[in-house]
C-alpha cells in the first residue's frame, strides 16, 4: 500500500541534491585551497542529518550545528558585502572585488545556494515532490532555518564597515521582512561594527532620484542608529558602468559619479 | 565514459585572440571546476586558470590576467579559453584539465590538447 | 608564486634500475603535490596524488613520499615504457605550480 505523502505549497527538493551537494564541496575546496581540511564526505551527512526523518515544518538552528561546526571559515571580518534581493550583482561585484564576500561566497553558503531540500518524518527519504512553503505552509523548515542561522552567523562575524547592496528597483528598497532585514540588521555587533554603508542600485537608465531618501532607507537608518551603528548610503545609478570602475578603476570615466 | 574533447588546431597571426573549447561528456559538467594548461614545445606544463561551470566564476593566474578569459556554455557543457594580443611566445600545447572526487586535488582527466601555432 | 624545483632535469637509465625524481618546493605545501606522466604529443597522465597516493590503475612500481618541501617519486624498477618526462605539481596555493620536468631516457 503506497504510503500517504504530506503534499506541500512549495517545489521539492532539487534534483541531484545529495550529489549537488557534495559536488560543491568538493569544488569550493578546490578553489579555496584553505578550506582543504574539510571532508566533503562528512560535510554531507552533516547536511543530511539536519533534515532527514525529521518534520520539515519542526527544524531548529540546533539541527544545524554539526554542520556549522564543519563549515566553520574564517573571512576578513571587514570585507563582507550583504545584499537584498539583488543577488545577481553581488555576486558579480565580488566575482571582481576578490578581497570582499558575501554569505554565498563561503563554503556553506556556495552549497546550499539556489537549492530546496526537506525530508520527511521518521523515514530516510528526502522529499523531491514538495517542500514546506514559508508562507503557507511554515516557517521553521530546513531551507528557511538554513539561511536564518549562516545569516545571523555571517552577520555576527562582521565588523568595521558592513556594506550592503539593496535594489531601488522595488516598491520596498528596505525590507523589514527580507533575511537582511530581519536577521542580518539585528546581529550586526554594535561594539564590532562602525558603519553600515548602503548601496542602492538604479535599475532605470534615466533615473536620477536620490534613492537614498526613500521611506523605507530612512527606516533602516533608524533601526541601525538605534542599535549604536553609524549609517551612511550611496546610489549606484550606473550597475554596468559600476562594476566596469571596480574592474577598471583607473578608467578616465570612473571619476564621474556611477 | 568520462571524456573531454578539444577543438581542433589553429594557425594564427601575432596579435589576433584564439578560442579553445572543451567539450564534457560522462558526467554533469557542473559538478567540477575545468583548468585550462598549457604547454609549450619542449618546456614544461604552465597552470593558466579555471572555471567554475555552475556559476561561471573563473580565476586567471596573474600572468594571463590580462589576455585569457575563460567562459562555458552549461547547455553544451562546454567550457572556452580565450587569449588576445597573441605573441610567439603562446605557441604551445593547451589543455583542459579536471579533478576527480577522491584523488586530490590532481587532475586524472585532460582533453587531447589543442595546437595552437602563432606566427608573424 | 611557489616554485617548483625538479631534479634531475635529465636521467639516464636501464630497464630494472631503480629511479628517484625530486621535486623542491619554495614554501611548505603541505601533502599538496602530485606527479604526472608525459610520453610525446600525449596529454599528461597523473601518477601519484597527495604525494603518496597511488591514482587508480597505475602500477605498484610508482610511489611518491614527502611532505612540506620535499617531495620524492620512485620508480622501483624501471619498465621500458616508463622513459618519459616526469612532472610534480602543487595545489596547495593558487596559482598550481609545475616542476621544470624531468626526462628518463635509455641510457
Known amino acids: 500500500v503506497p504510503r500517504w505523502r504530506q503534499q506541500w505549497s512549495g517545489p521539492g527538493t532539487t534534483k541531484r541534491f545529495p550529489e549537488t551537494v557534495l559536488a560543491r564541496c568538493v569544488k569550493y575546496t578546490e578553489i579555496h585551497p584553505e578550506m582543504r581540511h574539510v571532508d566533503c564526505q562528512s560535510v554531507w551527512d552533516a547536511f543530511k542529518g539536519a533534515f532527514i526523518s525529521k518534520h520539515p515544518c519542526n527544524i531548529t538552528e540546533e539541527d544545524y550545528q554539526p554542520l556549522m561546526k564543519l563549515g566553520t571559515q574564517t573571512v576578513p571580518c571587514n570585507k563582507i558585502l550583504l545584499w537584498s534581493r539583488i543577488k545577481d550583482l553581488a555576486h558579480q561585484f565580488t566575482q571582481v572585488q576578490r578581497d570582499m564576500f558575501t554569505l554565498e561566497d563561503t563554503l556553506l553558503g556556495y552549497l546550499a545556494d539556489d537549492l530546496t531540500w526537506c525530508g520527511e518524518f521518521n523515514t530516510s527519504k528526502i522529499n523531491y515532490q514538495s517542500c514546506p512553503d514559508w508562507r503557507k505552509d511554515c516557517s521553521n523548515n530546513p531551507v528557511s532555518v538554513f539561511w536564518k542561522t549562516v545569516s545571523r552567523r555571517f552577520a555576527e562575524a562582521a565588523c568595521d564597515v558592513v556594506h550592503v547592496m539593496l535594489n531601488g528597483s522595488r516598491s520596498k528598497i528596505f525590507d523589514k521582512n527580507s533575511t537582511f532585514g530581519s536577521v542580518e540588521v539585528h546581529n550586526l555587533q554594535p561594539e564590532k561594527v562602525q558603519t553600515l554603508e548602503a548601496w542602492v542600485i538604479h535599475g532605470g537608465r534615466e533615473d536620477s532620484r536620490d534613492l537614498c531618501q526613500d521611506p523605507t532607507i530612512k527606516e533602516l537608518e533608524s533601526i541601525i542608529s538605534k542599535r549604536n551603528i553609524q549609517f551612511s548610503c550611496k546610489n549606484i545609478y550606473r550597475p554596468d558602468k559600476f562594476l566596469q570602475c571596480v574592474k577598471n578603476p583607473e578608467d578616465s570615466s570612473c571619476t564621474s559619479e556611477i | 565514459q568520462m571524456q573531454l574533447v578539444q577543438s581542433g588546431a589553429e594557425v594564427k597571426k601575432t596579435g589576433s585572440s584564439v578560442k579553445v573549447s572543451c567539450k564534457a561528456s560522462?558526467?554533469?559538467?557542473?559538478?567540477?571546476?575545468m583548468n585550462w594548461v598549457r604547454q609549450a614545445p619542449g618546456q614544461a606544463l604552465e597552470w593558466m586558470g579555471w572555471?567554475?561551470?555552475?556559476?561561471?566564476?573563473?580565476d586567471v593566474a596573474q600572468k594571463f590576467q590580462d589576455r585569457v578569459t575563460i567562459t562555458r556554455d552549461r547547455s553544451m557543457s562546454t567550457a572556452y579559453m580565450e587569449l588576445s594580443s597573441l605573441r610567439s611566445e603562446d605557441t604551445a600545447m593547451y589543455y583542459c584539465a579536471r579533478t576527480k572526487y577522491n584523488s586530490g586535488y590532481g587532475f586524472p582527466y585532460w582533453g587531447q590538447g589543442t595546437t595552437v601555432t602563432v606566427s608573424s | 608564486d611557489i616554485q617548483l624545483t625538479q631534479s634531475p632535469s635529465f636521467l639516464s637509465a636501464s630497464v630494472g634500475d631503480r629511479v628517484t625524481i625530486t621535486c623542491k618546493a619554495s614554501q611548505n605545501v603541505d601533502s599538496d603535490v602530485d606527479w604526472y606522466q608525459q610520453k610525446p604529443g600525449k596529454a599528461p597522465k597523473l601518477l601519484i596524488y597527495?604525494?603518496?597516493n597511488r591514482y587508480t590503475g597505475v602500477p605498484s612500481r610508482f610511489s611518491g613520499s614527502g611532505s612540506g618541501t620535499e617531495f620524492t617519486l620512485t620508480i622501483s624498477s624501471l619498465q621500458p615504457e616508463d622513459f618519459a618526462t616526469y612532472y610534480c605539481m602543487q595545489s596547495n596555493t593558487h596559482p598550481r605550480t609545475f616542476g621544470g620536468g624531468t626526462k628518463v631516457e635509455i641510457k
Open positions: 597527495k604525494a603518496s
Open positions: 572555471i567554475d561551470p555552475e556559476y561561471g566564476r573563473t
Open positions: 560522462g558526467y554533469t559538467f557542473t559538478d567540477s571546476v
